[in-house]
Interface confidence: medium
């Protein structure tokens, strides 16, 4: 459509298979945890549900059964509130507003950026540049840091992180110099946007998400592959340096693909 300048990340959650579930830490038990729910986003593991009255937001753990994350009744900017984790779990009948969703300052008692980055050992914390951060607004930009999760609640409801599976990519080898540049190749931008939104969503186990395979200049490598699922290898395809699929190279997952003659680097 008109105006669709960028190829935005497409993130579809895949079913939680045995392999994914096998990597989960044992879930918390009572009395600390009265109800278990699936992690936010595409997470497969179980974590404690938030209880009635607990602070919540777009990127926090889920409210318990029968509860919904809502802005406070007098909240002037509901979208901003939810984006910033300033909602609360209440009876599911009422609807909220946008302020909660916007960029915001960390609330007192929330996990600080340094703590979050210290706790996160996955690709998301290594690659997403500091420029992808959120602001103060009714619709606050999604927070790249999970500062919406209260420290106090973290004691009851630990998040069980699962690292991204390692990929054959140079994405972690970008120099700090290139990180400071405002110019990136299209692959690098797609990767950042994908990881950025995943981080917003607190998706710590994004199985099924295609994080593109980039060269050091931020362009697409010739060969792109979907992530493997257990013993089943993800299918691969060939692209040019701008990520456009090249005809005649799509294996549809049947065989391995060789992109030898493709000019993409």
């Amino acid at each position: 459509g008109a105006g669709a300048v960028g190829a935005g990340p497409v993130v579809r959650c895949e079913p939680c298979d045995a392999r994914a579930l096998s990597q989960c830490a044992p879930p918390p038990t009572a009395p600390a945890c009265t109800e278990l729910v699936r992690e936010p986003g595409c997470g497969c593991c179980l974590t404690c549900a938030l209880r009635e009255g607990d602070a919540c937001g777009v990127y926090t753990e889920r409210c318990g059964t029968g509860l919904r994350c809502q802005p406070r009744p007098a909240e002037q900017y509901p979208l901003r509130a939810l984006l910033n984790g300033r909602g609360f779990c209440a009876n599911a009948s009422a609807a909220g507003s946008l302020s909660t969703y916007l960029p915001s300052q960390p609330a007192p008692g929330n996990i600080s950026e340094s703590e979050e980055e210290h706790n996160a050992g996955s690709v998301e914390s290594q690659v997403v540049p500091s420029t992808h951060r959120v602001t103060d607004s009714k619709f606050h930009p999604l927070h790249a840091k999970m500062d919406v999760i209260k420290k106090g609640h973290a004691r009851d409801s630990q998040r069980y992180k699962v690292d991204y599976e390692s990929q054959s990519t140079d994405t972690q080898n970008f120099s700090s110099e290139s990180k400071r540049e405002t110019e990136y190749g299209p692959c690098r931008r797609e990767m950042e946007d994908t990881l950025n939104h995943l981080k917003f969503l607190n998706v710590l186990s994004p199985r099924g998400v295609h994080i593109p395979n980039c060269d050091k200049k931020g362009f697409y490598k010739k060969k792109q592959c979907r992530p493997s699922k257990g013993r089943k290898r993800g299918f691969c395809w060939c692209v040019d340096k701008y990520g456009q699929p090249l005809p005649g190279y799509d294996t549809k997952g049947k065989d391995d693909v060789h992109c030898l003659s493709v000019q993409s680097q």
């Epitope: 459509g1 105006g3 669709a4 300048v5 960028g6 935005g8 990340p9 497409v10 993130v11 777009v58 919904r68 994350c69 809502q70 802005p71 900017y77 509901p78 979208l79 901003r80 939810l82 984006l83 909602g87 609807a95 909220g96 507003s97 946008l98 302020s99 909660t100 969703y101 916007l102 960029p103 300052q105 500091s130 420029t131 992808h132 951060r133 959120v134 602001t135 103060d136 607004s137 009714k138 619709f139 606050h140 930009p141 999604l142 927070h143 790249a144 840091k145 405002t182 946007d193 950025n196 939104h197 917003f200 969503l201």
Partner: antibody, heavy 118, light 112 residues
Framework: QVQLQQSGAEVKKPGSSVKVSCKAS????????TSWVRQAPGQGLEWMGG????????EYAQKLEGRVTITVDESTNTAYMELSSLRFEDTAVYYC???????????WGQGTLVTVSS | EIVLTQSPLSLPVTPGEPASISCRSS???????????LNWYLQKPGQSPQLLIY???RRASGVPDRFSGSGSGTDFTLKISRVEAEDVGVYYC?????????FGQGTKVETK
């Protein structure tokens, strides 16, 4: 590739209501802000409000509060904007647009022309 | 609400020459996280707006490198290093720091 497909043009009488749809395909829907932006003939862009489908959370521009309602049907990834008590000055092209975590509209619908005429 | 003021409102350009548009905000758009939540859009005749620049200086995917954004706080600039015929249209700045999200009045760029 994310696409936002809007419903067709409408001609309405003053005092009536109009409901415009915006169907999203090819990307995450529920956690983004789907906003509505309008543009009167020869004029600039005006943000009307938005919704986060996951939480059914809405927010509206103050000048339109009470007249505009934004809803979603998550089963079809479709957002709706209903504007009631239409006035002549509501004649405009109405756009839906998606905003992600960095508060910018990265994808826009093609626009829906709503004409208020007696 | 935050008010954005663009200048000039009309900008006649010569293809191959540089062009510059200013956007001034009624309050700082610099967030404590170091980001400036200022975006630039181009609306070509008969089309939907398209994102050019976000976070003040980050070029959107697919946007030619002749477009660049700069500025911090309340003063921002969009520059086109060498205007091309396809760059004509109305340019809008928009702030994403606070809702209601607001736009500048627009700058109409047309060839001389």
């Amino acid at each position: 590739q994310v696409q936002l497909q809007q419903s067709g043009a409408e001609v309405k009488k003053p005092g009536s209501s109009v409901k415009v749809s915006c169907k999203a395909s090819g990307g995450i829907f529920s956690t983004y802000v789907t906003s509505w932006v309008r543009q009167a003939p020869g004029q600039g862009l005006e943000w009307m409000g938005g919704i986060i489908p996951m939480f059914d959370t809405t927010e509206y521009a103050q000048k339109l509060e009470g007249r505009v309602t934004i809803t979603v049907d998550e089963s079809t990834n479709t957002a709706y904007m209903e504007l009631s008590s239409l006035r002549f000055e509501d004649t405009a092209v109405y756009y839906c647009a998606r905003a992600g975590g960095l508060s910018h509209f990265d994808y826009w619908g093609q626009g829906t022309l709503v004409t208020v005429s007696s | 609400e935050i008010v954005l003021t663009q200048s000039p409102l009309s900008l006649p350009v010569t293809p191959g020459e540089p062009a510059s548009i200013s956007c001034r905000s009624s309050q700082s758009l610099l967030h404590s996280n170091g980001n400036n939540y200022l975006n630039w859009y181009l609306q070509k005749p008969g089309q939907s707006p398209q994102l050019l620049i976000y976070l003040s200086s980050r070029r959107a995917s697919g946007v030619p490198d002749r477009f660049s954004g700069s500025g911090s706080g309340t003063d921002f600039t969009l520059k086109i290093s060498r205007v091309e015929a396809e760059d004509v249209g109305v340019y809008y700045c928009m702030q994403g720091l606070q809702t209601p999200w607001t736009f500048g009045q627009g700058t109409k760029v047309e060839t001389k």
